[in-house]
């Protein structure tokens, strides 16, 4: 018959306060004959949570079936977990004697904590846009946990990041904690799309690990770059030109037209389109009058992109002689 | 259903043998301390043998060298051999399975009579 | 040998009695006492292990108490049934020993 071993698989078992907790222990060897008992605590001290072979203990009920000759399992179910309850359980093995049963082997303990699951982390951007090729700070905090390891991770697309700060507060013992971390994140152009993620993994969370996220487009600015052009067929006695606006987010922006300094309200049609970055394109169309018109007109697209300063293009309008002298029905 | 049945018990004169049976049906023999119990007529009880789980044996004192527990585990069954029997033997014997962890008695047989007599 | 001594030895109790049966161990048994009760012609029937723990089948109305060396069965309320010799046995330790029995009879 092979020496009796107390196993005791957990070194800790974390538990949530009202929830039931189960204490494993198994034996390798039926003998010596004599019960099993659990206590918490270590020495003269120790507290008696259940015994196999008498007492009643209403919060305490065994996983197996004890009357069963062939049982080797003496692992056991606390109810109603308060945080008067944590400790160090023990499982340990009594030979029957008289006056009293001889302690004969005790498992290894397993320590109950209270545990508690981090809130969602909650990711913050920065308060103003940025543009790409500079560097954003992005917060994540969670609250609430327990015990206080825990493991923080910043990814960006899927890509785990680098440059961050993480702390857990407090430092000394309590019995909740809150983490807070800051990433520094460079900003590329095709950011709009992009997201960064925090994410929290503890062990209450069993493997499953909270995810807090932010999309990069709430703290990107891409900056348009402008295209001034002439189109070179003429309609009638107009020439049309196109300022075309590229790759730009946010959406906002206000274009206006000048000819020759003044003003124009007369922007004859515009479209926007998304790019497949998240970024937008928005091309407006000028039709300029010709007829009367002397050689050296200059138009100027300008915009303003997001509350930035504005930006603008000038066009000095070819007008040649042939185009002049275009009628407006002639047909090429 | 877990039960115990004795056989084997009988007449023998002074100085003989006998060899008790006790058949488990129910349960594993081998898994439980097992117990021989005897009971002279219109006397008390008397512990007589036992054999644990691990095969270790003892015996009472008025017995011990002339009586040998012993198992068959194939068989599922229990045996009492009882040598150099004497007078003082004759009583009904009772084969008891030994509890779960304390090895308190659970259940017993319905005995055999064993008679020493010339 | 651990010496268990039962009293008394007879009982003659009415249907509807409370009557207590005691057991005394030479030396200190812990709790490893059992109780039993044999009818005539009949096997013993296990009652009480640990001193006060029923097995199962067996109605309330039987319990046990005590520790060390000093037992007590008691019955609550006698029925027809009840009336038997009742055994206590001490099993801390080989030789198992039994008392001498306590025979209840009808009054």
């Known amino acids: 018959e092979e020496e009796l071993q107390m196993i005791q698989p957990e070194k800790l078992l974390l538990v949530t306060v009202g929830k039931t907790a189960t204490l494993h222990c198994t034996v390798t060897s039926l003998l010596p004959v004599g019960p099993v008992l659990w206590f918490r605590g270590v020495g003269p001290g120790r507290e008696l949570i259940y015994n196999q072979k008498e007492g009643h203990f209403p919060r305490v009920t065994t996983v197996s079936d004890l009357t069963k000759r062939n049982n080797m399992d003496f692992s056991i179910r606390i109810s109603s977990i308060t945080p008067a309850d944590v400790g160090t359980y023990y499982c340990v093995k009594f030979r029957k004697g008289s006056p009293d049963d001889v302690e004969f082997k005790s498992g290894p303990g397993t320590e109950m904590a209270l545990g508690a699951k981090p809130s969602a982390p909650v990711v913050l951007g920065p308060a103003a846009r940025t543009t790409p090729e500079h560097t954003v700070s992005f917060t994540c905090e969670s609250h609430g946990f327990s015990p206080r390891d825990i493991t923080l991770k910043w990814f960006k697309n899927g890509n785990e990041l680098s440059d961050f700060q993480t702390n857990v507060d407090p430092t000394g013992q309590s019995v909740a904690y809150s983490i807070r971390s800051t990433a520094r994140v460079v900003l590329d152009p095709w950011d709009v799309r992009s997201q960064v993620i925090c994410e929290v993994a503890h062990v209450t969370l069993q493997g499953d690990p909270l995810r807090g996220t932010a999309n990069l487009s709430e703290a990107i600015r891409v900056p348009p770059t402008l295209e001034v052009t002439q189109q070179p067929m003429r309609v009638g006695n107009q020439v049309n030109v196109t300022c075309q606006v590229r790759k730009f987010y946010p959406q906002s922006l206000q274009l206006t037209w000048s000819e020759n300094g003044n003003v124009c309200q007369r922007e004859t049609a515009s479209t926007l389109t998304e790019n497949k970055d998240g970024t937008y394109n928005w091309t407006s169309w000028f039709l300029v009058n010709i007829s009367d018109q002397r050689d050296d007109v200059v138009l100027t697209c300008q915009v303003k992109h997001d509350g930035q300063l504005a930006v603008s293009k000038r066009l000095a309008l070819e007008v040649t002689v042939h185009q002049k002298d275009q009628s407006s029905d002639a047909t090429p | 259903e877990v039960q115990l049945v004795e056989s084997g018990g009988g007449l023998v004169q002074p100085g003989g043998s006998l060899r008790l049976s006790c058949a488990a049906s129910g349960f594993t023999l081998s898994s439980y301390d097992m117990h021989w119990v005897r009971q002279a007529t219109g006397k008390g009880l008397e512990w007589v043998s036992a054999?644990?789980?691990?095969?270790?044996?003892y015996y009472t004192g008025s017995v011990k060298g002339r009586f040998t527990i012993s198992r068959e585990n194939a068989k599922n069954s229990l045996y009492l051999q009882m040598n150099s029997l004497r007078a003082a033997d004759t009583a009904v014997y009772y084969c008891?399975?030994?509890?779960?962890?304390?090895?308190?008695?659970?259940?017993w047989g319905q005995g055999t009579m064993v008679t020493v007599s010339s | 040998d651990i010496q268990m001594t039962q009293s008394p030895s007879s009982l003659s109790a009415s249907v509807g009695d409370r009557v207590t049966i005691t057991c005394r161990a030479s030396q200190d048994i812990n709790n490893y006492l059992a109780w039993f009760q044999q009818k005539p012609g009949k096997a013993p029937k296990s009652l009480i292990y640990t001193a006060s723990s029923l097995h199962s089948g067996v109605p309330s109305k039987f319990s046990g108490s005590g520790s060390g060396t000093d037992f007590t069965l008691t019955i609550s309320s006698l029925q027809p049934e009840d009336f038997a010799t009742y055994y206590c046995q001490q099993y801390v330790s080989y030789p198992y020993t039994f008392g001498q029995g306590t025979k209840l009879e009808i009054k």
């Open positions: 054999i644990g789980t691990a095969g270790d044996t």
């Open positions: 008891v399975r030994g509890g779960v962890w304390d090895d308190a008695f659970d259940i």
